[in-house]
């Protein structure tokens, strides 16, 4: 079993386009170009020489290392004289740099340079002038590199160019190779010998079907230049789910599981839960149990509460409040909240809609710890129905029918709603005649109208106020040429409602005998 | 894209000076050097010399010394050239075109759309 | 300083046809000369550097050849959009350009 060179790129080799990365995409440039040996090629080339600090990267496509622990880099390349090149004699360079950068999966088009281990700077044993450009000798520089030892699944290699004038004419990267074994759960692959008689080259090892490794403990071993494996260190551990079997990691058997690589050997299923199938990293929940999110695979499934018990109600004017008793049954958790649905129901065939967004609940309506809150802002008058659910970790993932207690009630008399449709029907100099619609929602016998106005110069400082049972009113002794601002509101034995938006209105000059509509300055929709 | 874009006709009177703008856009101004070439009605090209971007250096071909003078204004990525004492035979369409250097020889890969100087009494 | 000479000045081919345009120094060059194609009314182009690597966009029919002082340009086959005035320049410490070659329709 000889040692052998394994070949994992070879630039020259490819016919099509080598699509690597270059950043700035304005520096290295891919081109066809010709080998020592006239054969066309792919090649890299950069030579911007005229600016200082240039810092051009290009980088491979990712390499799979393969087998592979120690590699091998063959570059050849020409370089072009920097006193071939006009005028650029304080920015030109003769060398670039060789960088490497080990990832187990191609992380994409982003050069992130930090991360890149630089091998080597590169300078040409030889470079050409203007003169071999003309006979066409292209002074072809060969320079091998080494990396090594590599633990990761593979590598990008990265040339970066500080100013230099380049073509990279091939890329050779390869291997030697020891070969693979299974020691400790992990397959040890062919491998990368020594660089010298003596060394040993540490290896990573691969875990075996259906293992990982573990924790900061890399299964590893030596490869000796001889091509043997020595000194193992370090193991893989079986799956979740699997459990060890000489080299192998078997699935567990039913109704067993292993929720973590840790885990030496698999386990029975928690109480109310199972696994019908080999290799389970978790066992099912039987029917009506649920396992919560946060949950660990080790603990027993669990089912939502009963529903709360002894629910009763104390109702004022248009508030309620609600309290009750935990449930009977916890479903097995110590996680239960509670939330509140609320009905409006219609007086005659009992059907029921959700109450809306305008009610309040304090201090919540879900997520409730205490078991008690207060409803407030509900119609006057008006049947509700009020359902009470004891909620926990895994009430959301049951579909089942909900298990709550509920309460109706009919709430008393509410202040009346906002006065609407407030108009100016007539505007003289000294009075405005206005008219307006009685509210939505009178929530008991409107006694009388209250308007407010005062000169929109004061800004409500001081206002007068007038009272009228009919929907009408005029407004007398006001100054000619003022602007006015006025609001209307109900009142009931219940209380006053909420004063209407604002209406401007400005009187009529005194000069003016002739008589003309008022435009309303502005107007606004939220009431003072 | 990559652009140069040059001024539109100049018609001067011999004895008059002229400079043309050459605004550079979708490149970094200062990392490739910029040429001029001259090309008079129905002659060949001319190439009278290129200006190092970077430092502002120029270089002038034989026959274009002495009233030809290349200049930059990097802030605004502009060359210009300025010909002063205009004569008659200095008539011509004037290109400004950006210099590639490669590995294995150079170029100029980029071009301005020319300005034509017309130099008449 | 270098003079480039290009032949001939005016050469008819049919579209479909091979065009082989010359380009003579005066002395050995120190490199291999650029080629630029130049259409009426427009700016030249540049369709070859660095002795035989195409220019970004420029389509494989074009190719050079030549060292030391004979430097030829071929169309391999000639299209319609080819017709142009074409100009070898040498890029040593001075520029010069030959004084062209006319591609016109047979």
């Known amino acids: 079993q000889a040692a052998k060179e394994v070949l994992l790129l070879d630039s020259k080799a490819q016919q099509t386009e080598l699509e690597w990365i270059s950043s700035p995409p304005s520096g290295w440039e891919e081109i066809s170009g010709l080998d020592e040996n006239y054969t066309p090629i792919r090649t890299y080339q950069v030579c911007q020489v005229m600016e200082p600090n240039q810092n051009n990267w290009l980088r491979t496509n990712w390499i799979s290392k393969g087998n592979a622990q120690r590699i091998f880099v063959e570059l050849k390349f020409t370089l072009r004289d920097c006193n071939s090149l006009p005028g650029v004699l304080g920015t030109c360079k003769e060398t670039f740099n060789l960088y490497y950068y080990e990832t187990d999966y191609d992380t994409g088009r982003n050069i992130r340079e930090n991360l890149y281990v630089k091998i080597d700077t590169i300078a040409a044993d030889e470079s050409f002038t203007q003169g071999d450009l003309g006979e066409r000798k292209m002074k072809l520089n060969t320079e091998v590199r080494e990396i090594g030892p590599l633990s990761k699944k593979g590598f990008y290699l990265a040339f970066q160019d500080v100013g230099a004038c380049i073509a990279l004419v091939s890329v050779k990267v390869y291997y030697k190779k020891c070969w693979s074994i299974v020691e400790n759960l992990a397959v040890f692959p062919d491998t990368v010998t020594g660089s010298e008689f003596s060394s040993l080259v540490e290896v990573r090892g691969t875990c075996v079907s259906s293992a990982e490794e573990e924790a900061e403990n890399s299964p590893r071993m030596h490869c000796s230049a001889e091509g043997e494996w020595l000194v193992p260190i370090g193991k893989c551990i079986c799956k979740a789910g699997y459990q060890q079997k000489g080299d192998t990691c078997e699935p567990c058997g039913r109704r067993f599981y292993k929720s973590s690589s840790q885990d030496l050997q698999c386990s029975r299923c928690p109480t109310h839960s199972f696994s019908d199938r080999e290799g389970s990293s978790r066992c099912e929940c039987e029917d009506g149990y649920y396992r919560a999110p946060s949950d660990p695979p080790y603990v027993a499934c669990t089912r939502p509460p009963s529903a709360p018990q002894n629910l009763i109600f104390n109702i004022n004017q248009t508030t309620v409040s609600l309290e009750w008793s935990p449930p009977a049954d916890n479903g097995g958790r110590n996680d239960v909240t509670y939330r509140i649905l609320c009905k409006r129901c219609s007086w005659e065939q009992g059907e029921c809609v959700p109450c809306g967004s305008n009610i309040g609940y304090m201090p919540q309506q879900t997520g409730l710890e205490d078991n008690y809150v207060t409803v407030m802002d509900l119609l006057a008058h008006a049947n509700y129905t009020f359902e009470v659910e004891a909620v926990n970790g895994v009430s959301d993932l049951s579909r089942s029918q909900r298990l709550f207690a509920a309460v109706s009630i009919t709430t008393g008399q509410a202040a009346p709603s906002q006065v609407s449709g407030v108009m100016k029907e007539r505007v003289l100099q000294r009075s405005v005649q206005l008219s307006w619609q009685e509210p939505e929602h009178p929530n008991g016998v409107i006694t009388e109208y209250e308007i407010k106005y005062y000169e929109k110069d004061q800004r409500e400082r001081t206002y007068s106020t007038l009272k009228t049972k009919s929907t009408s009113a005029s407004i007398n002794n006001l100054k000619p040429g003022t602007v006015y601002v006025f609001q209307i509101r109900a009142v009931t034995a219940a209380g006053y409602g909420n004063y209407s938006p604002r209406l401007d209105v400005a009187t009529l000059e005194e000069a003016s005998g002739k008589m003309f509509e008022a435009t309303a300055v502005s107007s606004e929709q939220n009431p003072v | 894209q990559v652009q140069l874009l040059q001024s539109g006709a100049e018609v001067k009177k011999p004895g008059a000076s002229v400079k043309v703008p050459c605004k550079a856009s979708?490149?970094?101004?200062?990392?490739?050097?910029m040429s001029w070439v001259r090309q008079a009605p129905g002659q060949g090209l001319e190439w009278m010399g290129w200006i190092n971007t970077n430092t502002g250096n120029p270089t002038y071909a034989q026959g274009f010394t002495g009233r030809f003078v290349f200049s930059l204004d990097t802030s605004v990525s502009t060359a210009y050239l300025q010909i002063s004492s205009l004569k008659a035979e200095d008539t011509a369409v004037y290109y400004c075109?950006?210099?590639?250097?490669?590995?294995?020889?150079?170029?100029?890969?980029?071009w301005g759309q020319g300005t034509l100087v017309t130099v008449s009494s | 300083e270098i003079v480039l000479t290009q032949s001939p000045a005016t050469l008819s081919v049919s579209p479909g046809e091979r065009a082989t345009l010359s380009c003579r120094a005066s002395?050995?060059?120190?490199?291999?000369p650029a080629w630029y194609q130049q259409k009426p009314g427009q700016a030249p182009r540049l369709l070859i550097y660095?002795?035989?690597t195409r220019a970004t966009g420029i389509p494989d029919r074009f190719s050079a050849s030549g060292s030391g002082t004979d430097f030829t340009l071929t169309i391999s086959r000639v299209e319609p959009e080819d017709f142009a005035v074409y100009y070898c320049?040498?890029?040593?410490?001075?520029?010069?350009f030959g004084q062209g070659t006319k591609v016109e329709i047979k």
């Open positions: 075109a950006r210099v590639r250097f490669t590995v294995y020889g150079d170029g100029m890969d980029v």
């Open positions: 660095g002795a035989s």
């Open positions: 320049q040498q890029y040593g410490p001075s520029w010069t």
């Open positions: 002395q050995s060059v120190s490199s291999n």
């Open positions: 979708g490149y970094t101004f200062t990392s490739r050097a």
